[in-house]
């Protein structure tokens, strides 16, 4: 922001009324009036260019310093070209000297040169040559000097002429202030500019109404430079919750809008499924039946739990069941739907039921499922199972009701045994198998059926209570189709898949190869 100038002395504005002191009295400097642009103007002038050893002083009236620390002196003046006088006026000069003196009281007409300190020699950028003078073209020069720090109650300025032809048209003395400033929602008071060029006065700002320093942020500060300019802003204020920045102020959010935190963002419109907010709202309440999860941003619409999974099927495959379902028709307005599967088993004879989570195996953890299918295995044969698939989202925990669908399935067969070839020779195949432990107690015997591949007319059957068998009297280098099936009191269990195993050829009969 531009520096503010506080004027302490303005000769041009005073209309010749100031009555400055001239020394020696009646010689040298002289107050005169002229007409410029049809306006009367006053000036202090001296033009003793023909006589040498000039020492003419013009002293201002005493100027009260007030709060100024560094003063700026702006001079507007004209200087005639020494060559415009006959013979060049050998003693003629084209400069004058500027002095100042500080004092705590006005000395009146008591003028003492020794009290004055020289500020500078003032030289013109442009001199008034004869043609300019005759045409009344005033070649106005503007020079500015500064002095500081000042410490006394007031001061004088003085102008020393040493033989120039000069007219002072304007003497303006002022000091600079950094003006009152509103920036980053902080108010900085009008501040007197410091006196030392390298130093910057640090000024603390005050947050405007309804603005605060953000958490972890820096307090607002600015630096007032010597020239009255604000520099180096640090920190800021932000509008508090329920208020937004409008120009340089914080304004309450309009009804139907909200702002939930200290931030630079504007107020936002209340999202869907919220009640209309009052003025200055920090949040918008949810409509009845709609909720906001703790992690939901305030800008997100309020949501509700989903409806039940739309369609659920349970497909039995021996001692396994594949559960499949489709997403709920109503997601509740959320995308974070997960599914939970629970299992209940019932004994047909007694009708007794209980949870079966510990005895079954799921293809993936049954809680927090994101896919819409899961396979349940290790089911016991001749048991009734009921599976419940519950749909949940981020707000399901905020209500007591649940959204689920169930499917029941009866297991009539054991699970197909898993068959492995343990060893082979030219005339034998050693085969083993396994079924889930919960089903083993229900198995009476295992039936192993085998035949040559390509021979559909005959097959051989071997029964055993164990989990392995060696099939002898087989033809060398021949592929056999082998299937294992559990036999229970209730009948046959599910058969394993048909495996192809090949006996060794006579050349490689030296050992049993696996």
């Amino acid at each position: 922001a531009q520096g503010k100038e506080v004027v302490l002395l303005d000769f041009a504005a005073a209309g010749g009324e100031l009555g400055w002191l001239t020394h020696p009295y009646g010689k040298g400097w002289d107050l005169m009036q002229n007409i410029m642009n049809d306006m009367p103007i006053y000036m202090y002038s001296v033009c003793n260019v023909m006589s040498g050893d000039q020492d003419n002083w013009l002293r201002t009236n005493w100027v009260y310093r007030g709060e100024a620390e560094r003063i700026f002196i702006e001079l507007k003046f004209t200087v005639r070209d020494c060559n415009s006088f006959p013979g060049g006026a050998s003693s003629c000069k084209e400069t004058f000297n500027l002095y100042y003196a500080e004092s705590d009281l006005d000395y009146g007409t008591n003028f003492q040169k020794r009290l004055f300190t020289k500020i500078d020699t003032i030289a013109p950028d442009e001199i008034t040559v004869s043609s300019d003078f005759e045409a009344r073209h005033v070649k106005l020069n503007v020079e500015e000097r500064s002095v500081g720090p000042l410490t006394r109650k007031g001061f004088y300025l003085a102008f020393q002429d040493i033989g120039a032809c000069v007219a002072l048209l304007s003497v303006r003395v002022y000091y600079k202030k950094c003006p009152e400033l509103l920036q980053s929602l902080a108010r900085f008071p009008e501040t007197i500019a410091g006196s030392d060029a390298p130093s910057l006065a640090t000024v603390a700002g005050t947050c405007v109404d309804h603005a605060v320093v953000p958490p972890g942020g820096e307090e607002p500060r600015m630096h007032c430079a010597v020239d009255g300019e604000w520099l180096v802003p640090i920190g800021q204020c932000l509008c508090q919750a329920g208020y937004e920045k409008v120009e340089d102020a914080c304004q309450a959010c309009s009804p139907g809008f909200f702002k939930f935190e200290v931030s630079e963002s504007p107020c936002l419109e209340c999202p869907e499924h919220t009640l209309p907010s009052p003025e200055g709202a920090t949040s918008c309440e949810c409509e009845e039946g709609f909720f906001r999860a703790p992690q939901d941003p305030m800008s997100m619409p309020c949501t509700r739990p989903p409806s039940a999974p739309h369609y659920l099927t349970a497909v039995g495959m021996g001692a396994k069941v594949e559960l499949r379902w489709t997403p709920p028709q109503d997601s509740g307005g959320r995308e974070d739907i997960v599914y939970s599967v629970t299992c209940e088993q019932c004994w047909p004879e007694s009708g007794e039921c209980g949870p079966c989570e510990s005895s079954v195996r799921y293809s993936e953890p049954p809680h927090g499922l994101t896919r819409t299918s899961v396979t349940v295995s290790d089911l016991e044969p001749h048991m009734n199972y009921t599976f419940t698939v519950e749909a949940r989202n981020g707000v399901s925990g905020l209500v007591t009701s649940r959204s689920f669908r169930t499917a029941s399935v009866s297991i009539n067969q054991t699970e197909p045994p898993k068959v492995r070839l343990e060893g082979r020779s030219t005339t034998s195949l050693s085969v083993s198998w396994s079924i889930p432990p919960p089903q083993q107690s229900r198995v009476w015997k295992y039936e192993v059926t085998y035949r040559k591949k390509g021979d559909s007319n005959s097959y051989n059957v071997r029964r055993t209570e164990g989990f392995s068998v060696t099939l002898d009297d087989l033809a060398p280098d021949t592929t056999y189709l082998v299937q294992v099936q559990a036999l229970t009191q209730e009948g046959q269990g599910a058969g394993s898949k048909v495996h192809e195993f090949q006996t060794l050829s006579p050349e490689g009969s030296g050992s049993l190869a696996v």
């Epitope: 005169m32 009036q33 033009c47 003793n48």
Partner: antibody
Framework: EVQLLESGGGLVQPGGSLRLSCAAS????????MAWVRQAPGKGLEWVSR????????HYADSVKGRFTISRDNSKNTLYLQMNSLRAEDTAVYYC?????????????????????WGQGTLVTVSS | DIQMTQSPSSLSASVGDRVTITCRAS??????LAWYQQKPGKAPKLLIY???NLHTGVPSRFSGSGSGTEFTLTISGLQPDDFATYYC?????????FGQGTKVEIK
């Protein structure tokens, strides 16, 4: 030494015309503002007209405006006053006068000029 | 136009006397005032310009003062050569008007 010598005066009838000349010597004529000042017999001085060093600007007293024309020829170091529609009240001694800013020891020129150097004058009589 | 009024219109004085002539302007002319001396049958001669500045070659017994509307010409010790008519002239405006003159005669 500065010298200004007027000529061209004489007797003329009302409504007639006359051209006065002023020959300058002893100074740089082209640096001077030149003027005509008249003095009616037994009366005071009256400024008539002025002309700038290079021929402009020109100013006239209200009493002669539109009738008199001031001019100069710097190559001939001569000032002129062409007087038309002469009246009885124009009867006077006409002085040519000069001003050199070099001799005006002021920092800012005055709104107009005074007259540092004068000729001896030439008498103009307007009578029937 | 600015009117210039001189007083007195004539005065009698002796050699060695201090003589003061006054010139009044009808409006302020700052210090833009000149004084001239004229002897019978001769052209005027410049004495003082800018109210108080002595023209080159003019004796120091002549002095001028004043500003605004009131001005004075002072001859501090009248000499025989000083008996003449004195005119003031303002050059604050283009009309450059003269006073009516003050005649200084031998007593």
């Amino acid at each position: 030494e500065v010298q200004l010598l007027e000529s061209g005066g004489g007797l003329v009838q009302p409504g007639g015309s006359l051209r006065l000349s002023c020959a300058a010597s002893g100074f740089t004529f082209s640096h001077y503002m030149m003027a005509w000042v008249r003095q009616a017999p037994g009366k005071g001085l009256e400024w008539v007209s002025r002309i700038g060093p290079s021929g402009g600007p020109t100013h006239y007293a209200d009493s002669v405006k539109g009738r008199f024309t001031i001019s100069r020829d710097n190559s001939k170091n001569t000032l002129y006053l062409q007087m038309n529609s002469l009246r009885a009240e124009d009867t006077a001694v006409y002085y040519c006068a000069g001003y050199d800013s070099g001799y005006d020891y002021v920092a800012v020129a005055g709104p107009a000029e005074y007259f540092q150097h004068w000729g001896q004058g030439t008498l103009v009589t307007v009578s029937s | 136009d600015i009117q210039m009024t001189q007083s007195p219109s004539s005065l009698s004085a002796s050699v060695g006397d201090r003589v003061t002539i006054t010139c009044r302007a009808s409006q302020s002319i700052s210090t833009w005032l000149a004084w001239y001396q004229q002897k019978p049958g001769k052209a005027p001669k410049l004495l003082i310009y800018k109210a108080s500045n002595l023209h080159t070659g003019v004796p120091s017994r002549f002095s001028g003062s004043g500003s605004g509307t009131e001005f004075t010409l002072t001859i501090s010790g009248l000499q025989p050569d000083d008996f003449a008519t004195y005119y003031c002239q303002q050059y604050n405006s283009y009309s450059r008007t003269f006073g009516q003159g003050t005649k200084v005669e031998i007593k």
